[in-house]
Amino acid sequence: QGGTRSPRCDCAGDFHKKIGLFCCRGCPAGHYLKAPCTEPCGNSTCLVCPQDTFLAWENHHNSECARCQACDEQASQVALENCSAVADTRCGCKPGWFVECQVSQCVSSSPFYCQPCLDCGALHRHTRLLCSRRDTDCGTCLPGFYEHGDGCVSCPTSTLGSCPERCAAVCGWRQMF
């Protein structure tokens, strides 16, 4: 019964899958299945994903496209890349903000919110690592400032000010009486 299977149309292969009656060519990324093919190894009827929807991969059975995600304004997210027919919106943080994951095991799809980056300059410190995937890493005090407690204190401008040992080491002053 029947004939030999055509080598260019193997229903178990990647390019053709049984949809309805026949093995059909899938729809390319960015397209959804409107109707399956009407002959063996035929092309399905595929339509471009409507605005604000996408399908990222070639597919055989998707009869509708996925809705593009909206970036969460409440979490200060912004769209780094707008949604297209073949890719979802890529949400992230605007410059000067970093991603703070809302779960402990953080992956690319994990929920997150955006936090403002530390401004090392405002803290009178060197910037050791710029803020992007995590908060800014601030280094030692800027020239003209010395470590005092948790912060950086400005070197005294005259010999009349007090200058403890750390101050003297950085600012070049000895404590004067």
Partner: antibody, heavy 123, light 111 residues
Framework: QMQLVQSGGGLVKPGGSLRLSCAAS????????MSWIRQAPGKGLEWVST????????YFPDSVKDRFTISRDNAKNSLYLQMNSLRAEDTAVYYC????????????????WGRGTLVTVSS | DIVMTQSPDSLAVSLGERATINCRAS??????????MQWYQQKPGQPPKLLIY???NVESGVPDRFSGSGSGTDFTLTISSLQAEDVAVYYC?????????FGQGTKLEIK
């Protein structure tokens, strides 16, 4: 014993609706594509619709598309044809068929037919 | 759509003689080395019955006096020795692509 028992035919006015049923027995209904074929009085055979096994995709010629719907209930071993917006030219004997797939070339032939049910569309 | 055209429209053959019915498709119905077409027999007041599938394969239970041949676009149904019970209308049909289409039918009678 393989059987396709049809029901639901009758007289209907133009613009009216009718639902045909086909009860299958004697084979694994869910494993077969099924079709409806019609034959106008004294005329030849015309394909009306097919529904696939498994994923239940449906197919229609342009003459009935958007007016007819085909469905199946595998739990009840039943095939249905819902006919809306009927026209005088839809008058025919409607046959339910089992579609057997042959070999590995996705090739179907209607190997069993019901006895048919007459649909008359007239005012 | 693939148009199936049968010839002749009607045919009268003597009992025991050979009957030949032709069917031509408007385009090839071949796929992967198989002709996707079949022949049906319809006796008066009965539903059609599958006789031949894939152009030349005789369906189970069909008498061996029925045979089919042909490929591509041209096909033939042959009854080698006509019997009284063969009086019927015969239809060819293609399954190469949707919509499935039938020939107009050939009425076979006894001469």
């Amino acid at each position: 014993q393989m059987q396709l028992v049809q029901s639901g035919g009758g007289l209907v006015k133009p613009g009216g609706s009718l639902r045909l049923s086909c009860a299958a027995s004697g084979f694994t209904f869910s494993s077969y594509a099924m079709s409806w074929i019609r034959q106008a009085p004294g005329k030849g055979l015309e394909w009306v619709s097919t529904i696939s096994d498994g994923d239940s995709y449906s197919y229609f010629p342009d003459s009935v598309k958007d007016r007819f719907t085909i469905s199946r209930d595998n739990a009840k071993n039943s095939l249905y044809l819902q006919m809306n917006s009927l026209r005088a030219e839809d008058t025919a004997v409607y046959y339910c068929t089992r579609d057997r797939i042959y070999g590995s070339v996705q090739y179907y032939a209607m190997d069993y037919w019901g006895r048919g049910t007459l649909v008359t569309v007239s005012s | 759509d693939i148009v199936m055209t049968q010839s002749p429209d009607s045919l009268a053959v003597s009992l025991g003689e050979r009957a030949t019915i032709n069917c031509r498709a408007s385009e090839s119905v071949e796929f992967s080395g198989t002709s996707l077409m079949q022949w049906y027999q319809q006796k008066p007041g009965q539903p059609p019955k599958l006789l031949i599938y894939a152009a030349s394969n005789v369906e189970s239970g069909v008498p061996d006096r029925f045979s089919g041949s042909g490929s591509g676009t041209d096909f033939t149904l042959t009854i080698s020795s006509l019997q009284a019970e063969d009086v019927a209308v015969y239809y060819c049909q293609q399954s190469r692509k949707l919509p499935y289409t039938f020939g107009q039918g050939t009425k076979l009678e006894i001469k």
